[in-house]
Interface confidence: low
């Protein structure tokens, strides 16, 4: 058969790779490679990773794991996944928050910090996004209010002065 | 407002020991990786010690290995720099720095003011 | 030993502009470096991450006056209009993991002289 040796793997199962000298089984996702195999199509010396460490995919070749990163509160972010053996974890922003990029090119490994929702109702306006950043998200004014420069007014409940075309069910009914 | 403030340094001779400490506010000290970093008179920059934001990796330069010991206690907001058998070579200004840790990226984002370990017979 | 390399030393003139760079060793050719600032007897200084795409982003407080950019293994960062508070020594630095140990590797830093 000549003195060639195949480069492909001939082991049982389609984890093995080539590591040094033999073909040896990867190490699972959550471990890192300690030592390669010391036989042809043999096990990988694989040590699970240390506490803030993470691996998330079988591998055949990395001898480190990757750090977790940590939620900025600063930035007032929190953890929607704490971090796991397999898996890193996942910030983001608690409800009622959403996500400001801190680099124009935002993409989902970007810096980032969580800024307030705006409270629609809190201004007297109708919700029409599930979470608004400017005022001009939001809607017309709620029942009982009219618009007035910027912002939405009580309408009046006296029958004193007239009564705004958006206030007839308040105050229409006493002109 | 961020602030690392670093104490416990001072003149020792070769040989001694001392216990460097840094006390952290103004931010969530738990969430964040810190290292020693020290700078000899009119020199550069010299990485001296890593430690996770749970103690659960630990990393240190070669030329410190085996006598320097790095801690952490979160409840106390302190990290420490335990220096055993020191040497001539080991004088500098010594500055515990705060990784954000949360971008993915390797960033040293707040310095101490340092403090000054001298080593001499 | 992954090795960042610096000029020592780099003038400007009062209003002007300065380049600096900071060349990376091959095994560190792709990777994310930190500008710092350090004045006279004061503590470094965050300015910007620079990854090597080219895309940075500033520390808090640094005027746009910073700015950054990549080609292949160089990392720079230029400063315009350049003011007397600029005059200080500006160390890159890169954090890397190898053989399962973490680190940090500074450049030798280079000394701006405003003039």
């Known amino acids: 058969q000549g003195g060639t040796r195949s480069p492909r793997c001939d082991c049982a199962g389609d984890f093995h790779k080539k590591i040094g000298l033999f073909c040896c089984r990867g190490c699972p996702a959550g471990h890192y490679l300690k030592a390669p195999c010391t036989e042809p199509c043999g096990n990988s010396t694989c040590l699970v990773c240390p506490q803030d460490t993470f691996l998330a995919w079988e591998n055949h070749h990395n001898s480190e794991c990757a750090r977790c990163q940590a939620c900025d509160e600063q930035a007032s972010q929190v953890a929607l996944e704490n971090c796991s053996a397999v898996a890193d974890t996942r910030c983001g922003c608690k409800p009622g928050w959403f996500v400001e990029c801190q680099v124009s090119q935002c993409v989902s490994s970007s810096p980032f910090y969580c800024q307030p929702c705006l409270d629609c109702g809190a201004l007297h306006r109708h919700t029409r996004l599930l979470c608004s950043r400017r005022d001009t998200d939001c809607g017309t004014c709620l029942p009982g209010f009219y618009e007035h420069g910027d912002g939405c007014v009580s309408c009046p409940t006296s029958t004193l002065g007239s009564c705004p075309e958006r206030c007839a069910a308040v105050c229409g009914w006493r002109q | 407002e961020v602030q690392l403030v670093e104490s416990g340094g001072g003149l020792s001779q070769p040989g001694n020991s001392l216990q460097l400490s840094c006390e952290a506010s103004?931010?969530?000290?738990?969430?964040?990786?810190l290292n020693w970093v020290r700078q000899a008179p009119g020199k550069g920059l010299e990485w001296v010690a890593y430690?996770?934001?749970?103690?659960?990796?630990?990393s240190y330069a070669d030329a410190v290995r085996g006598r320097f010991t790095i801690s952490r206690d979160n409840a106390k907001n302190s990290l420490f720099l335990q220096m055993n058998n020191l040497k001539s070579e080991d004088t500098a200004m010594y500055y515990c720095?705060?990784?954000?840790?949360?971008?993915?990226?390797?960033?040293?984002?707040?310095w101490g003011q340092g403090t000054q370990v001298t080593v001499s017979s | 030993q992954p090795v960042l390399t610096q000029s020592p030393s780099a003038s400007a003139s009062l209003s002007g502009s300065v380049k600096l760079t900071c060349t990376l060793s091959?095994?560190?050719?792709?990777?994310?470096i930190v500008w710092y600032q350090q004045r006279p007897d004061k503590a470094p200084k965050y300015v910007m991450y620079?990854?090597?795409?080219?895309?940075?982003s500033k520390g808090d407080g640094i005027p746009d006056r910073f700015s950054g950019s990549s080609s292949g293994a160089h990392r720079y960062l230029s400063i315009s209009n350049v003011q007397s508070e600029d005059d200080a020594t500006y160390f890159c630095?890169?954090?890397?993991?190898?053989?399962?140990?973490?680190?940090?590797?500074f450049g030798s830093g280079t000394k701006v002289t405003v003039l």
């Open positions: 630095g890169a954090g890397y993991t190898l053989a399962n140990q973490y680190g940090w590797v």
């Open positions: 720095a705060r990784d954000p840790a949360y971008t993915g990226l390797y960033a040293l984002d707040f």
């Open positions: 091959s095994e560190l050719s792709g990777f994310t």
């Open positions: 430690i996770s934001s749970a103690s659960g990796l630990i």
């Open positions: 620079l990854k090597s795409d080219g895309s940075h």
């Open positions: 103004g931010f969530t000290f738990s969430n964040h990786d």
